[in-house]
Structures are given as C-alpha cells and as structure tokens.
C-alpha cells in the first residue's frame, strides 16, 4: 500500500502512515478495520457474553466468540454446566440444543423417536398400509387409515357393499379397494345411478374424443390419432418398434414416442454423442485437457495429478528421498524436505553452512540447495560476500541519489541528502509543503512554492498572511454625520436618530409607523415626530385619556371618566347629570288616604289621617266594626262612618223611626197610626171616603232605586236587582268584602261584580 | 414460583448409605434436566450427578460413580440421589439444581455428615 498525494487509498476516514522503507498502512478510526478500513469492525458492538473475547475476522467483516473457560455456544451465552453438556440427554445418537439456561431440544437421527430421542421409530418399517400415517407414540406406531380402509395398519379394505342403497335405481354394488362403483341398468348413470342416462351428455369420450349417439342408450367415440378404446380411454403405445440408439429409453408420448437418453448421447435417437469437454469446462480439474471421445470423455492431467478428473495430487513423497530425520511435504508433481537444524540441501543431505553464522550487519543467511556454502543477502548499504563492506551510494556512477540538487554525505551503510531551501525527505524529493503549517489567516488559501508560499486573501483582507484587515471606513461613506463601523470586507454605518439606510442616506419618515395613538394627527419633523393629540388625549403618542374626573363634577354620585367625557352615576335618591337634583319620591302621590307626604332622601314618609296607618296610609280602620247603625247599613269612611237607613228610619245612626202620620195623610177624620217605614189610616165607619185613603197602594210611588215593588197595599217589598241591597235597593253591593283576589291582589268593587289588579308575576280573574 | 425441597440428610458411618430426595413445585418437572451438587465445609460448589428431563439419560462426577445413584419420578415431580459406600469426603451441604447446576434454581439443602 503506498500513500501518494492525491490519492487516498483509505476509506471511512482512515489515516494513510508511511512506514520509513517507504510502504503504508491504513490507521482506522473506532469501529473500522481491514487494509483500507473497508470492513466495519464487526466487534464494535461486542455481542460475547459472560467475559467471551470477541475476534474480528479482517478478510470476511466477520466476528467470533473466543469464550472463557464455563462457557460455549455462539455468543458464549451458553454455560457448559448446561444439561446438554452435563447429562448428555440426547440418546442414539441425537443432537442436543441449548434453548435457554435450563432447557434443551433434541434433534434425532433417523430411525429415533422421543424426547431424547430414546424410542426406535416404529413408523420407519412403514407399517402402516393403503396410504395411511403412521405416528410414534412411546415404541409403538398408531395408524390413521384412509376412508375406506381399516385395521390396526389399515391393511384391511371396508366392503361397503355390505351396508344395503348404496346404489339407487336397481344398480349392482361392486366392492373396489378402499372404495366402490355402481354398476347402473341401461338408462340410468352417477355416482350412485341416480341421473337418468343420455349418451354424449355429457360426453364419456376423452382425450379429446368426439361423442355420436347411435341410438337411445348407445353411443360411439370417434378417438384422436394415438388414443383407442371405446371411449378413447387408451394411449395407444407407440414405442414398439422404436429407434432409440445407445441406451436410450422409449417413453411413449400421444401419436409418437421420445427416446430418453443416458448423459453421454443426445438428439431425436440418442445417435448423436454429447461434446463433455465443452458443456463442462471444468471436466477435468488442476489444468487438466479434456479430450472428447464418442460416447464420453478422457483427461490429460498435468504433472502430478491423477484421477478420471485429475483431481487426484500424486504422492511424491511416497518416492522420495528426504534424509532420515527431515519432514517430507508432498506437493503438486514434486515433494520438498523439511530439514532438521544443522542440516541443508534439497534432500537435507548437506550440513547448514548457516549456523555460524557467517553473514555481517544484519543481512540474511541462505545455504546452497546444491553444495551447502551459504549465500548472504545483504542489507542494503552493504557489499562483499559476508556484507563487511560500506557500499559508497554518493560515488555510484550513475547519478546522485540526492533529488533537487541535494548534498550526498557517505555514512556506514548508508548515506544522507542534505537539503537545499525548500525540500525535505531521504533523498531531498520531497518539496517542503510551507502550507502544512497553515500559515495563510482568515480564510486565506495557501499557495506551495519552491522554498515558500504565497497567500491569495480573502476579500476585506491584504498582507503576507493576509493578516491585515482593509479598513473600508476610510473613505468616510457615511453621510448625515453616521458613524462608520469597518467590518470584514464591508462596513457598517450607524445612523444618527431619523436617518437610515445603508449610509444613512435616507431621511426617515417618522410618521410612517402611525406612532400616534387614538386618533392624533401625527407631524414629521427631520429628527422625530410630533403628535397633535384629539379631544380628551395628552401624552407624547397621545395614549393618555385626560381624566374629566379630576375634579370631581358629580356631587352625590361616582363619576366614571369617558373620552372627553364623564357619566356621573348617582347615588340612591339622587338624579340629574352632575347628580345635584335631589328626587322627590312624593312626586307619585304614593300616600293613600289624604294621608300628607314629606320627600325624604331617596325616600319618603307619609303622616296619615286619623283612622288610617301603613306605610301608604293605605290601612283604613274599620269604623262599621262596632255595627253602630241600627236600622240601616254602616259606610265605612276615614276615621268616621255613614249609615244608610231602612225604609222609615232616619237620623245619624238610623235609630229613628220616622213618624209617617206627621204629614196628616189620612182625609176625613181617620185615625192615622205610624208603622215601620209606613202608616195606617183608620177611616171612620161609613162608606170609604177617597180621601180617606186607608188602602193606599204604595208601589205607586217607585219606592225601590234598583229593584221591582211588591206588595203596595199594605206596605211594600222591593226584590233588588242584581248587586244591589237595602230596602229601597239604594245600596252597591261590595263584592270585594269576601276578598276574593289571590296572592296579594287588589280588588276594585264594581256594580254587580269587582275587577282584580294583580301583582307582578301573577295573572287570571282572581290572580289565582 | 419455583421451589426445590431437599431431605433425607443426617449421620451416618463410613461405608454407610443414605438416600436424599428432591420435591419439586411451581414448573414442569418434565421439561427438565436436574442435577445434584454438594458444598463441603469451606469449599467451593462441586458437581455431583445429573439426569436428563425424560431420566434416559445420567452421567455422574468421577468422585461419586459407581457409588451414588441418581433417578427420579416425573409422576410425583420427586428427584432421588441414593448413596452407598459413604465416606468422610462425602460430607457436604446436598442440593438438588434444575437445569444449568451453576446458574439454575437451587433448594435450601440438606447436610449429610459422614463420621465414625
């Protein structure tokens, strides 16, 4: 292997090393080996256990276990404390593997049965017959026959003619092996002479035969050329006769025969004879000439090699003449004699002139196969024929060993080049590559010269190792007073506030960012911006809201700032925008009664009239409650009542009877006499006088208000219409008095009837 | 779970006998091959015979054959060792071991002392 500039014989990142004689090898990384690292190192991840030594196989990238001493198998996974080292259980010959730690399996040689293969197949006589399979089971077999067959080896066929209907339609049982046919009456066919029978249909012509029926249960086959029987059923055989030639075998075929021939003849009638020397042209073996003959083949071997294929190496040793106590090596078509120390020559007849040892400096000693005198090889810097003298390399005639120009100094055995400026190496050849030492900076790339070097620079960079770097600010690009930054190969310009680009040549509208908030107008200036702020804003981007809170407008409320704006939200009791207007919550006339209303702060109090109380004044005391109209009907009132006399009863409580007579109805002397709400008149004796009206019809003055009169001769009745009462039907029956609207319900008395008003959440005629 | 119960250990006479038995429970006595091992004061494991799962096939330590006996009873899951012609090299800590000796389940032992 020879590591050469340009040319890396190493893969997978391995290291080309020379050696000083001047061949290489490949150092491979972790994980590589082989001669050029090709082979990734099949050790690298170690699969030996229990401390097994894993080895690399170099050639094939292949590994094997090298295992401790307790310890076996591929991986050395496998204790040889295991069963199948220690007990040995696999009999007759069987093989034991190893499934685990514990257990095993045995594999049995043919003829052996069982889980140590410990039984004798008994299945291996076949004994089991009609096609029927034979298991072991300890020593003993156990067949399981086919239909048809039965007995302990199912030799024995079942007559299924025995057992009646098989066959339908009168058809004869015939018994067959392991089965049996129906042989049917004309007319009927199947199986089981269950079809009725029509000749061709279908056709019981085969191999291609044509069906004609020739009558109602007859038919005729016409067969295929090579094909006979009735119906066609017979290859006829067309081997007699054949012509097949040196051995070969007729094998009859449809209409004709093929000729099977043995493997030295070929063609239609074996005549023809097989060229082995080219179909195969390894016949012969070892170098071996194939000579083609009819009917077979021959080998010529070459020397040495024997055999109908020259396979065979002859033994020369079995001829040979080695002297006693040498080691004869058999090899093709000669034999060499391995020679005891001491002893030399091609049979070892000759003493070893090698072993006092005659050869100087190093050098290697053979003896004379022919004679016995030694020959010495020497190294190199040395001559003579026992290598004493100093070979002088600098006044070799030829030329000088020293390259570019090197001075050749003479040593003992050897020689050195001193070298000029530039080259290095044994011999001067080789030019000192001055970029080895990467002299070149930034990314300079390294030029090797004579002696040298030169660096090309990068851009932005200059000197002899590109060094330096180009200072671009020294032109001053930046412009609107920008401070310039040098970088590698550029520069980079710092722009003063409100300029930009990439030598702040731009003038930056700072308005363009809509740095003014809510609804300002924003106004460029050459270095910032400024923000003309809308109605309620301060601030520089006028994001402020100008608090209309500060000072507190709302007098009795909170006040909650909006854009220039402010809500007051007043507290109970309180109204108006800056919550200064007290409210009067007598405005409603929410007291009852003529009770009297004094506005309080979100409130109000009512001072009820006597007789009243709530707080509404919407409780009215009961003045009827201690019935003080005697003959009349109570009016409830505030703090005071009314009554509403009977017919013929007057004054405050309706207790006095009002004296009818006083008015002198009755004419003519009669005797008046006062009654309850009426009188009578006593006429005198004698005829009626009209003025003496003692029968006075009393309806005729339409006493009842709201109701029919009855009755008037001697007092009256009214029958009052519906919701009205009293005696003159002059009083609005209250329905409202057996409080008939539910769930907290208002009921306002109407005639002949009231009307509820409920309360929120409730509705229907009595707020039920 | 596997468990190995050794007995039949004691003292006994040079010359004399002794028969060590193994129940086994908690794994298909069947299936594998056993083992018995013994451990002599201050010494290290040592083998001392083994038989096959099927108890067709039995091998034993050069120290014990033609004196001891191993056999056993996959029916009554029992692994048996019978030992005649003890002597005082014999004394040891009896185990009976499935499978692998070195690396297989072991019982707790039983101590056979041979001693005049």
């Known amino acids: 292997l020879q590591c050469r500039d340009g040319y890396e014989p190493c893969v997978n990142e391995g290291m080309c090393v020379t050696y000083h004689n001047g061949t290489g090898y490949c150092k491979c990384p972790e994980g590589f080996l082989g001669e050029y690292c090709q082979h990734r190192d099949p050790c690298e991840k170690n699969r030996c256990q229990n401390g097994g030594t894993c080895v690399a196989q170099a050639m094939l990238g292949k590994a094997t276990c090298r295992c401790a001493s307790g310890f076996t198998g591929e991986d050395c996974q496998y204790s040889t404390s295991h069963p199948c080292f220690v007990s040995r259980p696999c009999l007759n010959g069987g093989t034991c593997h190893m499934l685990s730690r514990d257990t095993y399996e045995c594999t049995c040689q043919v003829g052996f049965t069982g889980k140590e293969c410990q039984w004798t197949d008994a299945c291996l006589s076949h004994p089991c017959a009609n096609g029927s399979t034979c298991t072991t089971v300890a020593n003993q077999f156990s067949c399981k026959c086919l239909t048809g067959f039965t007995g302990q080896k199912c030799e024995t066929d079942v007559n299924e003619c025995d057992i009646p209907g098989h066959c339908q339609h009168g058809g004869t049982c015939l018994n067959l092996p392991g089965s049996y046919q129906c042989q049917c009456p004309q007319g009927f066919t199947g199986q089981y002479c269950d079809s009725l029978y029509v000749p061709c249909a279908p056709s019981p012509c085969v191999n291609g035969g044509t069906c004609r029926q020739t009558g109602d249960f007859t038919f005729e086959c016409n067969c295929l050329p090579g094909f006979e029987g009735s119906t066609c059923e017979r290859n006829i055989d067309d081997c007699p006769n054949h012509r097949c030639q040196n051995g070969g075998v007729c094998v009859d075929g449809v209409n004709t025969y093929n000729c099977r021939c043995p493997p030295q003849w070929t063609g239609q009638f074996c005549t023809e004879d097989v060229d082995e020397c080219l179909l195969q042209p390894n016949a012969c073996q070892n170098g071996g000439t194939c000579a083609n003959r009819n009917g077979g083949y021959g080998c010529v071997c070459v020397n040495g090699w024997s055999g109908d294929d020259c396979s065979e190496n002859i033994d020369d040793c079995a001829f040979a003449s080695c002297t006693p106590g040498s080691t004869c090596i058999d090899r093709v078509a000669s034999f060499s004699c391995m020679c005891p120390e001491g002893k030399a020559g091609l049979l070892c007849h000759l003493d070893d002139a090698c072993i006092s040892n005659p050869c100087h400096k190093g050098a290697l000693c053979d003896t004379n196969p022919l004679n016995g005198q030694y020959i010495c090889t020497c190294p190199q810097g040395y001559k003579g024929a026992d290598c004493t003298e100093d070979v002088d390399e600098c006044a070799m005639a030829n030329s000088n060993p020293c390259e570019h120009a090197g001075k050749c100094v003479n040593t003992d055995g050897a020689f050195h080049c001193e070298c000029l400026k530039g080259y290095a190496g044994p011999r001067c050849e080789m030019d000192i590559n001055e970029c080895h030492s990467d002299p070149c900076q930034n990314d300079a790339t390294c030029l090797d010269k004579i002696g040298g070097f030169t660096c090309l620079c990068m851009p932005g960079f200059k000197g002899v190792h590109c060094e330096l770097e180009i200072n671009e600010c020294q032109s001053n690009p930046c412009v609107n007073n920008g401070q310039c930054v040098d970088k590698v190969n550029r520069f980079q310009c710092l722009c003063p506030p409100g300029f930009t680009g990439p030598v702040c040549q731009i003038d930056i509208d700072d308005c363009s960012s809509t740095p003014c908030l809510n609804g300002a107008k924003c106004i460029d200036h050459p270095n910032g911006y400024e923000c003309q702020c809308a109605t309620g804003f301060t601030g520089v981007l006028c994001e402020e809201n100008i608090d209309n809170c500060d000072p507190d407008p709302c007098h009795h409320g909170q006040c909650q700032d909006g854009i220039d704006s402010y809500t007051c939200i007043c507290n109970p009791g309180y109204m108006g925008a800056i919550c200064s207007d007290q409210i009067d919550e007598c405005y409603s006339s929410p007291c009852l009664n003529d009770g009297r209303c004094i506005d309080l702060v979100n409130g109000y109090q009512c001072n009820c009239q006597p007789g009243t109380s709530g707080v509404n004044c919407e409780i009215n005391f009961d003045d009827c409650a201690s019935n003080p109209c005697i003959h009349g009907i109570c009016m409830d009132g505030i703090n005071r009542y009314s009554c509403v006399c009977s017919p013929g009863f007057t004054g405050q409580r309706c207790n006095i009877d009002i004296d009818e007579c006083a008015s002198n109805p009755c004419r003519k002397g009669a005797t008046c006499i006062n009654g309850v709400n009426g009188f009578r008149c006593i006429c005198p004796e004698g005829p009626h006088h009209p003025s003496c009206y003692s029968q006075v019809n009393e309806c005729l003055s339409n006493p009842c208000i709201h109701g029919n009169c009855t009755g008037g001769l001697s007092g009256y009745k009214c029958l009052c219409d519906a919701g009205w009462v009293g005696i003159n039907c002059e009083v609005d029956k209250n329905e409202c008095l057996s409080n008939p609207c539910q769930n907290g319900g208002t009921c306002d008395n109407l005639v002949n009837g009231y009307r509820c008003t409920c309360k929120k959440g409730f509705k229907g005629y009595n707020c039920q | 779970e596997v468990q190995l119960v050794e007995s039949g250990g004691g003292l006994v006479q040079p010359g004399g006998s002794l028969r060590l038995s193994c129940a086994a429970s908690?794994?298909?006595?069947?299936?594998?091959?056993m083992n018995w091992v013994r451990q002599a004061p201050g010494k290290g494991l040592e083998w001392v015979s083994s038989?096959?799962?099927?108890?067709?096939?039995?091998t034993y330590a050069d120290s014990v054959k033609g004196r001891f006996t191993i056999s056993r009873d996959n029916a009554k899951n029992t692994l048996y060792l019978q030992m005649n012609s003890l002597n005082p090299e014999d004394t040891a800590v009896y185990y009976c071991?499935?499978?692998?000796?070195?690396?297989?389940?072991r019982g707790q032992g039983t101590q056979v002392t041979v001693s005049s």
């Open positions: 071991a499935r499978g692998d000796w070195r690396y297989g389940s």
């Open positions: 908690g794994f298909t006595f069947g299936d594998y091959a």
């Open positions: 038989i096959s799962a099927g108890g067709y096939s039995t």
